[in-house]
């Protein structure tokens, strides 16, 4: 239970006072205010919004609100030389061109500075050649093409449908397959829900709608020119040839009307199975090239975007802690959008704004949190999590010593079905306890708790009567805090009932149609889901900043470590002969997990019994909890991914959005049967088991009695 003893404040100022102050109507008003014009990173409009937020946070009562600026590599289309893709005939004449911009939504026809759809950081180029359809361009899709179908993508332009995995992974896979260009498109199978009208009459993607997005493979580096260090005034910048994560081939996104024109003429091989077919009226032939009558026609890309070092601005607000001002609980979400940002990010930014307002109201009445709360409005998230990463790089020494927790606050909704939470196991009990105290906004669950509706609609696959909580992956601003610095992190939002479509996003994601009206008309007219998300995010921050003992349960880490060890062992056991031949043993890992479990259990017992009135002991126990996440950090990082340093979790090497457990071992085992030197490959597996076992054991020891 949360307690206010140490903060010397009136009983009125408890969690309930904070939660009661949050209002749906305010979130609605803030969302409207944040979505009337585009706020693309690096633009004057986004700088003005940063200054507005700074001013309002000060008015709300924060102790200080500063802008933190960095000069980072961004990418923009050429205003006078638009990007497009053509079908050309044998004479080189363009017989079809993809659209130059999206048809604007009603009411926004005269808005200027709507950036046309583009793939941020695509190099310039005008490749032409035959088309190959590569499904989602996942690792397994290229395996199917190259190994089973014997189709060579070398020198071809590949067309891939969005969805399932992060677009940057698609581009990386295409590059490795030898493609000379990539076309990304949204298939109605993934971005058009049956029975729903397209925008502006519903929340589905129209044929002219296009998903923007960056196509970097940064692996946590931040600004591509200053990996590991802040992009400040005296930064040393790499040359563009040495920049981290930039794609080497032109890439461009299109909508399904344009995709129809490219795909309807495809010839070559038939799709290998039904999982390669979308919902367009086309054969989904793989190619290469066009069929019969059209075999002399080619596809040509015209990409003229430029990479530019541009100033970005984070807004950092501080609410100083009364008792432990040197312990930081951070609530952060981004401000920059591709266009209007109706959902991404402003549905999150509006919630953060209301949380700040509520905390400010309490502060004006004389209350302070026990620990310091930092609020952040990050810039350039859409360009590779740049604002948050640069700030964390600049403040890494403070953060690694003082960072208690990071709560992310991007889009508050991606649907209106149920809650979705991804977090460190340390926060499981916090989330469970909090959601039991909150009212469910769901129809049919009036008078019931959020925990109850969430558990009913999204049950845990392992534990009955509990809700699903997922692993943290990446693709958002928690990345640097969790994966690089080892600060306990979590995120929460309302989601859809599309478990199969987990990583495709909502239909209008990153399109011009992501407007205020989309949210107000179709997703959350009463803003009740936004309010619930504000209560969850704000409630987590409140508890993390105010509870005397940190609301972390290390026993939950023990449980998942065992689960992850079992999982990785079973993957390895698909190769029993090799494990025997190369003497591969997981004994050290299972032993370490057993030790962790026992030590965590004893620590939890001590946590119940220690004298909480002794500030030294209290601080000691809290520090052990705070530093537990940090203990899973390997300073050397993962192989070829130095900024992914968490040994238990990393973004999947095949999908940045997804989290992978024991990623070092997982990657060493992946496709091991195809490795040219099995002895070396299995040696790396053994090394990764050693690193994982050591790290788990070392983390366990941080929970042992100190002397």
């Amino acid at each position: 239970k949360s307690s206010n003893e140490a903060t010397n404040i009136t009983p009125k100022h408890n969690m309930k006072a904070f939660l009661d102050e949050l209002k749906a109507e305010n979130i609605k008003k803030f969302l409207y205010n944040f979505t009337q014009i585009p706020h693309l990173a690096g633009t004057e409009q986004n700088f003005q919004l940063a200054k507005q937020i700074q001013s309002q946070w000060k008015e709300f009562g924060l102790d200080s609100v500063e802008l933190a600026h960095y000069d980072v590599l961004l990418s923009y289309p050429n205003k006078t030389h638009p990007n497009y893709i053509s079908i050309i005939n044998e004479d080189g004449n363009e017989i079809f061109n993809t659209s130059l911009f999206e048809p604007p939504p009603p009411g926004y026809e005269n808005v200027s500075d709507i950036v046309p759809p583009f793939s941020a950081f695509s190099p310039q180029g005008m490749p032409e050649g035959d088309l190959v359809y590569v499904n989602y361009a996942r690792t397994e899709d290229f395996f199917k093409l190259e190994r089973d179908m014997k189709i060579n993508c070398s020198g071809k332009i590949v067309i891939a449908r969005y969805g399932k995995v992060f677009r940057g992974n698609k581009v990386k896979n295409a590059q490795l397959a030898g493609a000379k260009g990539v076309i990304l498109y949204s298939d109605p199978a993934d971005y058009f829900a049956p029975g729903v009208k397209s925008y502006p009459d519903g929340w589905n993607l129209p044929g002219g709608g296009v998903q923007r997005g960056n196509i970097l493979n940064l692996n946590g580096a931040g600004d591509p020119l200053t990996p590991g260090y802040p992009a400040n005034e005296y930064a040393y910048r790499r040359g563009i040839a040495e920049a981290v994560g930039l794609p080497s081939i032109p890439v461009h996104p299109i909508g399904y009307y344009d995709a129809q024109k490219l795909l309807e003429k495809m010839g070559g091989s038939a799709p290998p199975d039904s999982s390669w077919r979308g919902s367009l009226k086309v054969p989904y032939n793989v190619g290469p090239g066009f069929t019969g009558n059209f075999s002399t026609q080619k596809v040509k890309m015209h990409i003229h975007s430029t990479n530019e070092v541009t100033r970005i601005y984070n807004v950092i607000g501080t609410l100083r802690g009364a008792v432990e001002p040197d312990r930081y609980v951070i609530l952060g979400g981004h401000r920059d959008s591709w266009v209007f940002g109706g959902i991404d990010p402003q549905s999150g930014a509006a919630v953060v704004h209301e949380i700040v307002r509520s905390f400010g109201t309490l502060k004006k009445e004389g209350w302070r949190p026990r620990r310091t709360i930092l609020f952040a409005s990050w810039d350039a998230e859409e360009f590779g999590l740049l604002g948050s990463t640069e700030w964390a790089e600049e403040n890494s020494r403070l953060l690694q010593e003082r960072g208690v927790a990071y709560i992310n606050a991007d889009s508050s909704i991606e649907g209106n079905y149920t809650l979705r939470v991804d977090c460190t196991p340390l926060m499981y009990s916090l989330v469970h306890n909090l959601t039991k105290e909150l009212k469910s906004p769901d129809e049919g669950f009036e008078g019931k708790s959020l925990y109850e509706s969430w558990t009913k609609k999204s049950p845990s696959p392992e534990f009955s009567g509990m809700p699903r909580i997922s692993k943290l992956g990446s693709g958002n601003d928690f990345e640097v805090f969790f994966q690089r610095l080892g600060i306990a992190s979590g995120r929460a939002r309302y989601t859809k009932n599309w478990e199969t479509n987990k990583f495709s996003g909502y239909p209008l994601y990153h399109s011009v149609y992501e407007t205020y009206e989309l949210v107000e008309k179709f997703y959350d007219p009463m803003f009740k889901y936004h309010l619930t998300v504000a209560q969850v995010r704000g409630g987590m921050v409140f508890e993390l900043a105010n509870s005397i003992v940190l609301p972390f349960d290390c026993r939950d880490y023990a449980v998942v470590l065992r689960k992850y060890a079992d999982k990785i062992y079973s993957i390895s056991m698909k190769h029993p002969q090799e494990m025997k031949t190369y003497s591969v043993s997981f004994d050290s890992l299972f032993s370490a997990v057993k030790n962790f479990t026992e030590i965590a259990s004893k620590f939890s017992e001590r946590l119940q019994d220690f004298d909480k009135s002794n500030p030294i002991v209290l601080r000691m126990m809290n520090d052990q909890l705070m530093f537990l996440e940090r203990a899973f950090i390997d300073p050397l990082g993962l192989p070829d991914r130095p900024f992914y340093r968490h040994v238990i979790y990393a973004p999947s090497s095949h999908n940045k959005y997804a989290g992978e457990s024991f990623p070092g071992i997982y990657d060493a085992l992946f496709d091991i049967e195809s490795k040219v030197d099995p002895s070396k490959a299995w040696g790396e597996v053994k090394r990764q088991i050693y690193v994982a076992a050591f790290t788990v054991q070392a983390a366990a020891e941080t929970l042992s009695e100190v002397a």
Epitope: T98, L100, P103, E109, G207, G208
Partner: antibody, heavy 125, light 111 residues
Amino acid sequence: EVQLVESGGGVVQPGRSLRLSCAASGFTFITYGMHWVRQAPGKGLEWVAVVSFDESNKYYADSVKGRFTISRDNSKNTLYLQMNSLRAEDTAVYYCARALRDGNNWDYFNGMDVWGQGTTVTVSS
Amino acid sequence: QSVLTQPPSVSGAPGQRVTISCTGSSSNIGADYDVHWYQHLPGTAPKLLIYGNSNRPSGVPDRFSGSKSGTSASLAITGLQAEDETDYYCQSYDSSLSGWVFGGGTKLTVL
């Protein structure tokens, strides 16, 4: 009320030029493809040209290719047909028409759902 | 010579049913491109009657229906009325011409 109003027709000598305009109102012009269609005296309808909403694509009937240019000014909600090197066989009533929204394709690959009343072009010496 | 072939004229008595055919080829109707039908009284704006082979815009009576099969399409009018006497055109897209094509038109006479 959705409306298309053509103007700019008239009598012109062979080899000369003429520019037709079509003013659109009552709908979001910038989001629609637009066509020109003509009807010569005593003949049927003949498609002339089409332009996509963003001018990324323009297509012409073989009979006018290289002589006619379709364009649009989305800020003025106006469609144009610039007709050069006019011939006697270009004599017709010229209609502008809005492309029809339907199916899994750009509207300009579909039919035409809203038509203007037409403007008459006579090419005669 | 139109790419889409229609009969020059058809006729029927009031209350009767008439059909107007529209025959194309493998590069237009047969290539799965939609067929649209228009009613045109000379000197006025043509009116969309049927779109996407068989769909009626709002305001068009259900006496008008369209169908498509293979390389041809047809327009059926039931319960003929005097005001139906005018010209009817079919239209589709032709991939070999990269253009939009009309039939030559059919004059409907209500006897």
